[in-house]
């Protein structure tokens, strides 16, 4: 069973996040400089004619792009997709961004720019001020704050109104750690490293980021092929050879926004035996409530039994018991020459009265915890109340 | 960069440490090897140390050696030293390339011990 | 334990020519395979990680190949400077150990 229960479907991770309904409100929304007061942050709003009808930076975006739109969700999204247009002014607006670049935050403090799948950064935007320009972010971004920093190629103005959509990021996860994936050499390389990590990548040990191992996207039976257009073999996945691991497992450590109960981990494997893929033998799961704190209470063990012999991707689900923890570390025992993972998520409940905790490494940011969920949230819903989500589909207009 | 220091002449049995000093990171994300030389021979791996504190030693240095760690030194103690002992001791510090793969990237310029009555 | 043991010991070829050095590890490695260059009172030289993978700022005139067992780092257009002894190593994230080396001699 290939089924990620209790996982996000990147698909329906579509919902406008409140630009243009208004339920971010002014307060969330800043800048670097403004034109004007009737240019200022609060009139980026896509659709608005707030003001003189946008976002305009007082500065020059040419050649420094040091300019930037600040939206903070007051707490972790997924973003999808993202969309702008530029000044309105009664229809008499002539300014708009014909690329803009983003970069994006969890924890206020460590700031990551944004880049698709083969590593460009920069955007295509609008035309004209008044079209709406959706971007299909590939990969897609979880974030509590996102910067826009419009571009030009010459001096002259540009403006900016936005809309981001996504959806509430339930599973808490902040970053993971783990070791660097590997190639596999078959008769062509099969690149299993985790392209999208944003984290640090160091000795061996990418940590501090999240990646392709939480991106919703599930791995096909074939490891070779991709859900994904123009990438290389391998895309999907992240892998490890047990050759270059003496003690005969891959480790990983799992940070979390706050304290949580964990009932499950779901993690989605290959198990293309016939090229050396296989399931993992067993897991093993430590928890601990603080970074600098102890491991608790006994590790949890699960050995893997089921159908090894066949050799299509699954999801494994490895009971944790309802540990309540903030850290996980698990180690994933070799049955094979190769781990294969696509996809890790949890399933856990947030125990009542635990204060976010951002980022074990930083101190807890000013402005944390927030205050109140956005009104169109509650703590069980992924997306708002009464929208439809932007659909995903050939022809629409996303770039 | 890396530099060992502690090399000198001792005496059979002696216990010695040498201390590798990592300058420009952290050594907590790094596995770090010892390696030695004898004069005139190859290189002998003796132990590496993990980013979580984990030890491998080669099967001949089990009970030899004891490597130990901070985020800036890497110690190596030699227990009860042998005139076979006598060698350049390097630290090392693994890495990985574009395949995903570790290899040593980065060397000290090695500490020579000589065991001798 | 692991034993990779390294073949010839030492070879000798001219300037220009190409020489080849066979590494062998007692059971299979995959693709966990490095190799260094020393020169003579010098720290070694990291070349190739990952069989293939060749480290920064080495020329392309090094080459390795090979899978499991079996192994080989290939020099061709050989030039003086290469003149140095050989390792190959096996490097997962733990027991690392070394081939006995080949000296390479150019003439």
């Known amino acids: 069973d290939a089924d990620m229960k209790g996982h996000f479907d990147p698909a329906k991770c579509r919902y406008a996040l409140g630009m243009q309904d208004r339920t971010i409100p002014d307060s969330d929304i800043s800048a670097s400089s403004s034109w004007s007061d009737s240019t200022a942050a609060r009139h980026s709003r896509l659709e608005s004619s707030d003001g003189d009808g946008a976002w305009c930076p007082a500065g020059s975006v040419f050649p420094k792009e040091e300019e930037y739109l600040q939206v903070d969700l007051q707490r972790l999204h997924l973003v999808a997709l993202v969309g702008t247009q530029g000044r309105h002014a009664g229809g008499l607006g002539k300014e708009f961004s014909r690329s803009y670049r983003l970069r994006y935050s969890r924890d206020g403090r460590r700031w990551m720019g944004w880049k698709d799948r083969w590593g460009q950064e920069v955007i295509s935007g609008n035309e004209d001020p008044e079209g709406v320009v959706l971007k299909d972010l590939g990969p897609p971004m979880v974030a509590r704050l996102v910067r826009f920093y419009p571009r030009a190629d010459r001096v002259m103005s540009v403006c900016l109104r936005v809309e981001l959509y996504g959806c509430l990021w339930r599973d808490g996860l902040l970053s993971y750690t783990a070791p660097v994936g590997q190639t596999m050499y078959l008769s062509e390389a099969v690149y299993l490293n985790d392209s999208t990590y944003d984290g640090h990548t160091v000795g061996g040990l990418q940590y501090g980021g999240l990646g392709q191992l939480a991106d919703g996207v599930v791995g096909l039976d074939d490891f070779r092929k991709s859900q994904e257009l123009r990438v290389w073999p391998g895309y999907d996945y992240v892998g490890w050879s047990n050759h270059s691991f003496s003690s005969g497992y891959v480790e990983m450590e799992f940070e979390f926004d706050r304290l949580r109960a964990f009932q499950a981990m779901q993690v989605h494997c290959n198990n293309m035996h016939t090229l050396g893929a296989r399931l993992p033998g067993g897991v093993e799961c430590r928890f601990r409530r603080g970074p600098a704190m102890a491991w608790e209470g006994e590790p949890m063990r699960h050995n893997l039994g089921g159908n090894l012999g066949d050799p299509r991707a699954r999801a494994v689900s490895v009971p944790l018991g309802g540990r309540v923890a903030r850290f996980l570390q698990c180690r994933f025992l070799f049955a094979g020459p190769w781990l294969l993972f696509s996809e890790i998520s949890f399933i856990s409940d947030v125990v009542n009265n635990s204060s976010p905790a951002l980022g074990g490494t930083f101190p807890p940011a000013p402005w944390w915890p927030p205050g109140p969920p956005p009104t169109n949230f509650s703590s069980l819903e992924l997306e708002p109340r009464g929208q439809q989500p932007v659909a995903k589909a050939e022809g629409s207009p996303t770039a | 960069s890396l530099e060992e220091s502690g090399g000198r002449l001792v005496t059979p049995g002696t216990p010695l440490t040498l201390t590798c000093t990592a300058s420009g990171f952290s050594l907590n994300r790094y596995y770090m090897l010892w390696v030695r030389q004898a004069p005139g021979e190859g290189l002998e791996w003796i132990g590496t140390?993990?980013?979580?504190?984990t030890t491998y030693y080669a099967s001949w240095a089990k009970g030899r050696f004891t490597i130990s760690k901070t985020s800036t030194t890497v110690d190596l103690k030699m227990t009860s030293p042998t005139t076979e002992d006598t060698a350049t001791y390097f630290c090392?510090?693994?890495?990985?390339?574009?395949?995903?793969?570790?290899?040593?990237?980065?060397w000290g310029p090695g500490t020579l011990v000589t065991v001798s009555s | 334990e692991l034993v990779m043991t390294q073949t010839p010991a030492s070879v000798e070829a001219a300037v220009g020519g190409t020489v080849t050095i066979k590494c062998q590890a007692s059971q299979s490695i995959g693709s966990v395979l490095a190799w260094y260059q020393q020169k003579p009172g010098q720290r070694p030289k990291l070349l190739i990680s990952?069989?293939?993978d060749l480290a920064s700022g080495v020329p392309s005139r090094f080459k390795g190949s090979g899978s499991g067992t079996e192994f080989t780092l290939t020099i061709s257009d050989l030039e003086c400077a290469d003149a140095a002894t050989y390792y190959c190593q096996y490097i997962p994230y733990g027991s690392s150990p070394f081939g006995g080396g080949t000296e390479v001699v150019v003439k």
């Open positions: 140390i993990s980013y979580g504190d």
């Open positions: 090392a510090r693994a890495d990985t390339g574009d395949n995903g793969y570790l290899g040593l990237q980065l």
């Open positions: 990952g069989v293939f």
